[in-house]
């Protein structure tokens, strides 16, 4: 039985040209976390760590994308094109698999303030 | 970049055998190193990998009970050891190394062929 | 365990041909997937990886394609050297698996 939930920083804003930082928190579970993907609207793999072997940063990213902090991505030299949704997976053993979803708008005003969290069940 | 995989080794079911895989040309702590199965005229497997750096394997759980992995820095070596050998285990034995964080098999060694018979 | 199936184990293809290697994820593997090729009596080689980059040194007649469950790995223009099998990978989740090949035979 699936009694975990997924905490993700919801839905953020962040200046072009910036960077932002992508966070998910797995929660109310005793399940080991054996890898996390991260995805990106389109289904592009960011970034995976496993447990194990650390993290892999895919190609397209390697240059904008940072391991951490924790489990979570750092997104640099933030573009237009790089607002939309962002899922993080978290594989687990015993529990299976749970999904987080950030919605990022990278905005061209100087002024860009992350919202509140929300919870994802 | 180079991967030196030990020689051919013929042994008896139910013992042991030990491989080796010594890496030149980077640094080896830096880079996880993993090992891939493929039996006479068959597929890949991969069997597992093990960072240098701290020891840390993960595994195929189908080779859980059967490849230990280790490594010995001083000398740049990884190490599999296989045991309670089986006919099933006779196959060549490959080690490969990743890219930087990239769990591409980027660099293979020569490969050891494990032939197990009574 | 993700299966990636290659549903052909043969293609005869002759010099100069254009040639495509299909290679299907049971479940979804986002862009994680990697191309190998393997000549008689050699190590793999790595080609193609996520899913699309050619790895440093690979001609430019080796590409790569697709998301998700389905993927294909092109040759534009078949040389004899290319005889070989080529393997499709999956490392987006452990443990990472391996497609059963196709051989590549030179008519």
């Known amino acids: 039985m699936m009694t975990g939930t997924i905490e993700t920083t919801g839905n953020i804003s962040a200046k072009k040209g910036g960077s932002v930082i992508l966070q998910c928190h797995l929660s109310s579970t005793m399940a080991q976390v054996t890898q996390v993907n991260w995805e990106q609207h389109d289904h592009s793999l960011l970034a995976i760590r496993n447990a194990e072997l650390g993290w892999h940063i895919y190609p397209a990213f390697k240059d904008r994308v940072a391991p951490g902090p924790g489990l979570g991505l750092t997104l640099q030299s933030l573009t237009m094109n790089d607002t939309g949704e962002y899922f993080c997976t978290y594989h687990t053993y015993p529990d299976g698999t749970y999904r987080g979803r950030i919605f990022l708008e990278v905005l061209e005003s100087s002024v860009a303030e992350h919202s509140a969290r929300f919870q994802i069940p | 970049v180079q991967l030196q995989e030990s020689g051919a080794e013929l042994v008896k079911p139910g013992a042991s055998v030990k491989l080796s895989c010594r890496a030149s040309g980077y640094t080896f702590t830096d880079y996880f190193v993993y090992w891939v199965k493929q039996r006479p005229g068959q597929g890949l497997e991969w069997i597992g990998g093990i960072n240098p750096s701290n020891g840390g394997a993960t595994f195929n759980e189908k080779f859980k009970n059967k490849a230990t992995l280790t490594v010995d820095t001083s000398s740049s070596t990884a190490y599999m050891q296989l045991s309670s050998l089986t006919s099933e285990d006779s196959a060549i034995y490959y080690c490969?190394?990743?890219?930087?964080?990239?769990?591409?098999?980027?660099?293979w060694g020569q490969g050891t062929l494990v032939t197990v018979s009574a | 365990d993700i299966v990636m199936t290659q549903s052909h184990k043969f293609i005869s293809t002759s010099v100069g041909d254009r040639v495509s290697i299909t290679c299907k994820a049971s479940?979804?593997?986002?862009?994680?997937v990697v191309w190998y090729q393997q000549k008689p009596g050699q190590s793999p080689k790595l080609l193609i990886y996520?899913?699309?980059y050619r790895y440093t040194g690979v001609p430019d007649r080796f590409t790569g394609s697709g998301s998700g469950t389905d993927f294909t790995f092109t040759i534009s223009s078949v040389q004899a050297e290319d005889l070989a099998v080529y393997y499709c990978?999956?490392?987006?989740?452990?443990?990472?698996?391996f497609g059963g090949g196709t051989k590549l035979e030179i008519k």
């Open positions: 490969t190394r990743g890219n930087f964080y990239g769990y591409e098999f980027a660099y």
């Open positions: 990978q999956q490392h987006y989740i452990t443990p990472w698996t």
């Open positions: 996520s899913p699309s």
């Open positions: 479940q979804h593997v986002s862009t994680a």
